[in-house]
Interface confidence: medium
Amino acid sequence: EEELQVIQPDKSVLVAAGETATLRCTATSLIPVGPIQWFRGAGPGRELIYNQKEGHFPRVTTVSDLTKRNNMDFSIRIGNITPADAGTYYCVKFRKGSPDDVEFKSGAGTELSVRAKPSAPVVSGPAARATPQHTVSFTCESHGFSPRDITLKWFKNGNELSDFQTNVDPVGESVSYSIHSTAKVVLTREDVHSQVICEVAHVTLQGDPLRGTANLSETIRVPPTLEVTQQPVRAENQVNVTCQVRKFYPQRLQLTWLENGNVSRTETASTVTENKDGTYNWMSWLLVNVSAHRDDVKLTCQVEHDGQPAVSKSHDLKVSAHPKEQGSNTAAENTGSNERNIY
C-alpha cells in the first residue's frame, strides 16, 4: 500500500480581517493511525493551532467530523481572523506512539494572508496658530492595514496638495502596517472656512477611500486691521471716536482706549459680526468730553488679539477746534449707529 501523503491543496489563502479562514488538508490513507495537528510556522518555534487529540481551541472548528473512523479530511476553519494570524500553516500527521505520538508527515503548508482595513486617518495640525502666508505642517496617521500597498493623498478644499512626505512602516515583512504622512500647507486669508483632508486608499476599501479632516479654523490666526475715525456729535463739548476692528480670527480680542497714554477703558469683543470668509468685525466707541482737556488729546485704540502683542492706531484730537470740524474720514450722523456701544 502506498505511503500516506498529507495534501494541502492551497498554497495560499487570502482572508479579510474579521472573516473566517478555511485551511484545507486531506490524507491519502488511514494508516498509520494517529492524530492530526495544525501549526503555524515550522521548526522548534512553531505555534500549535489545533490538536485533534486534546486541548481547547475556541477559534478553530473542523470542516468534517474527525471522530469518524474513515475520515481523511482534516481541514479547519479559523474564525475572526486578524492580521496577527498571518503566516504559513502546516497540517501534520502524527503516528500513535508511547508515551508520545511521533510526527509522521507534514503537508507543504498554506500561507494565510490577511487583508486588514486601515484605521480611520487621524489628521493633526500644529500646536500653535499661524497667520496667513505662513506654511504649517499637518500629519496624517493610519494603522493596522495589510497588505502593505497603500495610497495616501492630501487635499485642501478639494484641491490636491503636492508638498507632502509619506512613510509606511515597518519596511520589512509584517502582519500589519502603519502609514504616516506630513503635508505642508500655506495659509491664506480665507482659510477660516478651509479644510485639510487626508485620503487613504487601500485594496480592502473597494474604491471607497477613508478620509480624515482638519479644520484650518483651529490653525489660523488672522490679525485685525484697525481704523480710528472721529464722528460728528451734536453736543459742543463731546467728541465721539470709533475704533473699527476688522477681519480678525479667532474672536478672542481685548481692546483698550488710551487718552494721552493713560488707560481710559478696556473691553472684550462680544457682539461681533462675521464676514463671508469667517473672520470677525467689531467696533468700539469712545465719547470724549473735550471740555475736560486743555491741550490736544492723543486717543489710541490698542488691541490685543488672541494673546499676541498689542497693535494700536492713534487719532489726534485737537481741542482748540470746533468738534464738528475734526477728521475728514467720518461717517455721517445718520448711519444709525447702535447707541448701546457708546460709552
Partner: antibody, heavy 131, light 103 residues
C-alpha cells in the same frame, strides 16, 4: 429692478469740494454695503470709498488716492449714499459710479467686502476738475 | 496689486479663460463695453452669477488666482473685463482690465 442714479457731477475747480449723491431703488437699501468707484479717462476702475450697513457698526473704507479727502455717508431713510471729496485735484477727473455690494448683514453675519461682491452699478456721473 | 492679462482673443464658440492673480481674497468680474460706460457684473464672490447674466459665464478660484471662464464665446462678449479684489491691507482694488477680442 435695482437702479442706482448718480448726481452732482460736472465741472469742478481744483482745491474745491465735490458732493455726489446716489439714489437707490429696487432693493432694501439698509441691508447692503455701498460704494463709489471711479474711472479716469482712458484708465481702469479705481475704488474710491465704501460704507457698510449701519446696523453692523462697521463704518467706512477709502481708496488710497482719496484717503483723508473723502467722506462717504448714507441715509437709509432716503436710500441715498453721498460722497464728499475735498481739495479736488486734476487727477480726480473721471466718471464716478455708484455700486451696490451683494454683501451686507443678516443676523450676526456681516461683510466688509465690497470690490469683489459688487452686483449692481449706476450709469455714472462725469466729474471734470479743471481751472 | 492685482494682475490680469492685458488682452485675450478667441473665435466665436471657443472657451476663453481670463485669470486674475491677487492677494488671495475673493474675486468679482466686471464687464465694460466702452470706457466710461457703466460696468456690468458678470461674476461676484468668486463664482456667483447675477440672474441676468448668461450661464456661459462662470467663475472659479484656485489658491490666490481667480478665473473667469466664458464657454462658447460670442461676438457680444467683446469688452474689457476687470477683476475686483482686496489687497493684504483689505483695501478694495481692481485689475487693470483684460480686453477680450472675438475674432
Amino acid at each position: 429692478a435695482v437702479t442706482l442714479d448718480e448726481s452732482g457731477g460736472g465741472l469742478q475747480t481744483p482745491g474745491g469740494a465735490l458732493s455726489l449723491v446716489c439714489k437707490a431703488s429696487g432693493f432694501t437699501f439698509s441691508s447692503y454695503n455701498m460704494g463709489w468707484v471711479r474711472q479716469a479717462p482712458g484708465k481702469g476702475l479705481e475704488f474710491v470709498a465704501g460704507i457698510y450697513i449701519a446696523s453692523g457698526d462697521l463704518g467706512t473704507t477709502y481708496g488710497a488716492a482719496v484717503q483723508g479727502r473723502a467722506t462717504i455717508s448714507r441715509d437709509d431713510g432716503q436710500s441715498t449714499v453721498r460722497l464728499q471729496l475735498n481739495n479736488l485735484r486734476a487727477e480726480d477727473t473721471g466718471t464716478y459710479f455708484c455700486a451696490k455690494s451683494a454683501g451686507g448683514c443678516s443676523a450676526h453675519s456681516c461683510d466688509t467686502y465690497i470690490a469683489d461682491s459688487i452686483d449692481a452699478w449706476g450709469h455714472g456721473t462725469e466729474v471734470i476738475v479743471s481751472s | 496689486a492685482v494682475t490680469q492679462p492685458a488682452s485675450v482673443s478667441a473665435n466665436p464658440g471657443e472657451t476663453v479663460k481670463i485669470t486674475c492673480s491677487g492677494d488671495s481674497s475673493y474675486y468679482g468680474w466686471y464687464q465694460q463695453k466702452s470706457p466710461g460706460s457703466a460696468p456690468v457684473t458678470v461674476i461676484y464672490d468668486d463664482n456667483k452669477r447675477p440672474s441676468n447674466i448668461p450661464s456661459r459665464f462662470s467663475g472659479s478660484k484656485s489658491g490666490s488666482t481667480g478665473t473667469l471662464t466664458i464657454t462658447g464665446v460670442q461676438a457680444d462678449d467683446e469688452a474689457v473685463y476687470f477683476c475686483g479684489n482686496e489687497d493684504n491691507s483689505y483695501v478694495a482694488i481692481f485689475g487693470a482690465g483684460t480686453t477680450l477680442t472675438v475674432l
